[in-house]
């Protein structure tokens, strides 16, 4: 009950994160800024993964995408490949994970088959969060470098002359969303690993291995634990209370991953 | 890197009117505003005029009612009208541009300046 719980949950912890991760990879405000102030009007700036926005204060917005831009940074690059390879991985564990669930039955799918899947998706969920992760801090070093790098200069341009602008930024709420979401895919990934152990089964499957004595002698072991010589040996070792020796033939059962000699 | 040509200054009567006009080009993402600026002689350079890209207009208190600023967004061109000179409005006159720059700071483009002489 336990182990499919934690891979319920665990399930339903990645699928938020994922869908955390797919949100905050679309959203504009991964970067807030201040591009421009005066007594009357404000004009905010905010910066997504895929285009840009301003909005005044007065009301007026418009985004722009950064296909019209030819020296796109190549960080920006990087962050969105992790971000849509967490994606890729994250749905492709969902699907693997959906099909692991212990809930569902699907076949005769034995439990050794979905403990692997179970794990696959784990490392898929883990892999995926990664990814996150690792792109919106990338997103986030890249903007603080820029940003202090870019210190207030004047220089002399064609037809003039050229100033870059102290404002002010903060890092957007997609950035956090993809921080949490990352860390949500994590924790699931790493709640399915464990709900992969819980479903393993346990117990090392021996070869049962029994050798014939010259006649069909039944012997008895100390505590009253039948042994027999031949294939059929009670293979649940119950104990045998009616003290009647049986033959061979009448305990016979069928080998199974329980056999013991 | 934004190019920026003034034209349209020159010599006017007090009382007269002008049009200063300012072409930006070349390669950017995106002006944010644009505003036109003013040095007289031993003086330091003030703001006369912005307008955003949305059309939010701001004068300085001087120039209110005798001044119209205004934008071609299609054209990337900003526009000075000037009404009712006075002797005190006798400067060179500076146009300014604010370009987006993606993930970084924004910059302010300046022109070379044309000169606006109100005389009789």
């Known amino acids: 009950m336990a182990v499919t719980a934690c891979q319920g949950l665990g399930f339903v912890v990645s699928l938020i994160g994922i869908a955390g991760i797919i949100a905050a990879t679309c959203m504009d405000q991964w970067s807030t800024q201040d591009l421009y102030n005066n007594p009357v009007t404000a004009v905010f700036n905010y910066q997504g993964l895929w285009r840009s926005c301003v909005r005044e204060s007065s009301g007026f917005t418009e985004c722009r995408g950064y296909f019209t831009l030819l020296g796109l940074p190549a960080m920006l690059q990087a962050v969105r490949a992790l971000m849509i390879v967490g994606i890729v991985l994250g749905a492709i564990g969902l699907l693997v994970s959906i099909f692991a669930l212990k809930c569902i039955r699907i076949g005769s799918m034995e439990d050794s088959a979905k403990a692997n899947m179970t794990l696959t998706s784990g490392i898929m969920f883990i892999v995926s969060g990664l990814c996150a992760i690792a792109g919106v801090s990338v997103f986030a070093n890249m903007l603080v470098t820029n940003f202090w790098m870019s210190t207030a200069n004047m220089y002399t341009g064609m037809g003039g002359m050229v100033q870059t602008v102290q404002t002010r930024y903060t890092f957007g709420a997609a950035l956090f969303v993809g921080w949490v979401a990352g860390g949500l895919t994590l924790i699931g990934g790493v709640m399915m690993c464990i709900a992969c152990r819980g479903l393993a089964p346990e117990e090392t499957n021996y070869k049962a291995v029994s050798y014939h004595a010259s006649g069909h002698s039944v012997a008895y072991k100390p505590g009253g634990f039948k042994a027999s010589t031949g294939f059929g040996s009670n293979t649940k070792n119950k104990k045998i209370y009616d003290g009647g020796a049986r033959t061979e033939d009448e305990v016979q059962s069928y080998p199974s991953k329980h056999d013991y000699v | 890197e934004v190019q920026l040509v003034e034209s349209g200054g020159g010599l006017v009567q007090p009382g007269g009117s002008l049009r200063l006009s300012c072409a930006a080009s070349?390669?950017?993402?995106?002006?944010?505003?644009m505003g036109w600026y003013r040095q007289a002689p031993g003086s330091q350079r003030e703001l006369v005029a912005t307008?955003?890209?949305?059309?939010?207009?701001y004068y300085a208190d001087s120039v209110k009612g005798r001044f119209t600023i205004s934008r071609d967004n299609a054209k990337n061109t900003l526009y000075l009208q000037m009404n009712s000179l006075r002797a005190e409005d006798t400067a060179v006159y500076y146009c300014?541009?604010?370009?987006?720059?993606?993930?970084?700071?924004?910059?302010?483009?300046w022109g070379q300046g044309t000169l606006v002489t109100v005389s009789s």
């Open positions: 307008i955003t890209r949305g059309g939010s207009t």
């Open positions: 070349g390669s950017f993402f995106r002006i944010v505003a």
């Open positions: 300014n541009v604010r370009v987006e720059v993606p993930f970084m700071q924004p910059n302010d483009y």
